[in-house]
């Protein structure tokens, strides 16, 4: 039994880091393998992660962490029974994938304006709370070409757009994702999408 692709890990910079790797053949990850992880700190102890299968030869493990600070460094040991298959380290602050925003809502009751709001996925005491920027994706269910991205570079989790920038009388969907420049993170996953029917009063034509 050998590791084909070494574990790579990403952290949500809050409580979970996810590590993925591939074995050289079909493996029952949860019964055959264990990933031991330990914070490099005098008084820390090793914790065991039981991996799950992620495709035939792929494994994934969700490492639980109390919290994360920039100096944190973890040692990782991948075991198959008594055999050490791989040894490495992981610094969560250097491999951050933010949590996805939630509670995306489209408010259509503001005159001729669409207000999209969503929730910051981090609590106020987390460092990323004040460092997230967002991308909002809006697309038409009827027209695949009607697909647009709005970059929200301010901290407020909201976006206002004129309803008239979208076609009237058809349904649209929106989703949002986040990233943080300060840690050069990857983009989060997209939030679940939300749907609304876009309708607005066309202005009277002047003759």
């Amino acid at each position: 039994m050998k590791v084909l692709q070494e574990p790579t890990c990403v952290s949500d910079y809050m409580s979970i880091s996810t590590c993925e790797w591939k074995m050289n053949g079909p493996t029952n990850c949860s019964t055959e393998l264990r990933l031991l992880y330990q914070l490099v700190f005098l008084l820390s102890e090793a914790h065991t992660c039981i991996p799950e299968n992620n495709g035939g030869a792929g494994c994934v493990c969700h490492l639980l962490m109390d919290d994360v600070v920039s100096a944190d460094n973890y040692t990782l040991d991948l075991w198959a029974g008594q055999q050490l298959l791989w040894k490495g380290s992981f610094k969560p602050s250097e491999h951050v994938k933010p949590r996805a925003p939630g509670n995306l809502t489209v408010h259509t009751n503001v005159s001729d304006t669409l207000l999209l709001t969503w929730s910051n996925p981090y609590p106020p005491d987390n460092y990323l709370y004040n460092h997230l920027t967002y991308a909002v994706n809006i697309w038409s269910e009827n027209d695949p070409a009607d697909f647009r991205i709005y970059n929200v570079t301010y901290l407020e989790p909201s976006l206002r757009i004129a309803a008239s920038t979208l076609k009237s009388g058809i349904s649209y969907r929106a989703r949002v994702r986040a990233w943080a420049q300060c840690y050069n993170t990857t983009w989060s996953e997209w939030s679940p999408s939300t749907k609304w029917h876009n309708s607005y009063r066309e202005p009277f034509e002047q003759h």
Epitope: F41, L42, L43, S44, E45, V69, A71
Partner: antibody, heavy 116, light 109 residues
């Protein structure tokens, strides 16, 4: 709410023994390392000893090595410090502290006086 | 001592005050510093951990920074209730223990 309550302090003669206890509540005791820190009257803080969450690893300051023993009972949510061969310079308020990278929660302390 | 602090510091209300903590050559190359506040007659309280992180409930008037084996605690908008003893500390892996500075007594004039 995290609470740490020390007990067991008092007056003891040089060469004597004392056992301090620290009752913990408001958090999962078995998941946290713990420590003892002391403060002699009018002096600064001095780290005494620390123990990992399971009790597998233990550390002592040179000044108490061989005389003090730290231990814990995770089933009772209690931290202990057995102090033997006490000296006048061990006179101090002894604080119990939870460890999360630093000493993030402290008890109110218990006074140990070593005097004849 | 492995960590050296000035014995005293002072400032007037509203002022910004900085307390230094200098690590000796015996200290690890990249220590992580913590700061504690001890108000008169009370137990110490964690103010800053891992160089610059504030526990919840600590006002943002308190900030920490690090440069090599030295650290600083800054208090802006000084208040009378900030009058206390301040200690820096770090885990010393060569000693397998925790070291604390001698403490700095802050007086608000």
């Amino acid at each position: 709410e995290v609470q740490l309550l020390e007990s067991g302090g008092g007056l003891v003669q040089p060469g004597g023994s004392l056992r301090l206890s620290c009752a913990a509540s408001g958090f999962t005791f078995s998941r946290h390392a713990m420590a003892w820190v002391r403060q002699a009257p009018g002096k600064g803080l001095e780290w005494v000893s620390a123990i990992t969450s399971s009790g597998r690893s233990i550390y002592y300051a040179d000044s108490v090595k061989g005389r003090f023993t730290i231990s814990r009972d995770n089933s009772k949510n209690t931290l202990y410090l057995q102090m033997n061969s006490l000296r006048a310079e061990d006179t101090a308020v002894y604080y119990c502290a939870r460890v999360h990278r630093a000493f993030d929660y402290w008890g109110q302390g218990t006074l140990v006086t070593v005097s004849s | 001592s492995v960590l050296t602090q000035p014995p005293s510091a002072s400032g007037t209300p509203g002022q910004r005050v900085t307390i230094s903590c200098s690590g000796s050559a015996a200290l690890d190359l990249s220590p992580s510093f913590n700061w504690y506040q001890q108000l008169p007659g009370t137990a110490p309280k964690l103010l800053i951990y891992a160089d610059s992180h504030r526990p919840s409930g600590v006002p943002d008037r308190f900030s920490g920074s690090k440069s090599g084996t030295s650290a600083s605690l800054a208090i802006s908008g000084l208040r009378s209730e900030d009058e206390a003893d301040y200690y820096c500390g770090t885990w010393d892996y060569s000693l397998s223990g925790y070291v604390l500075g001698g403490g700095t007594k802050l007086t608000v004039l």
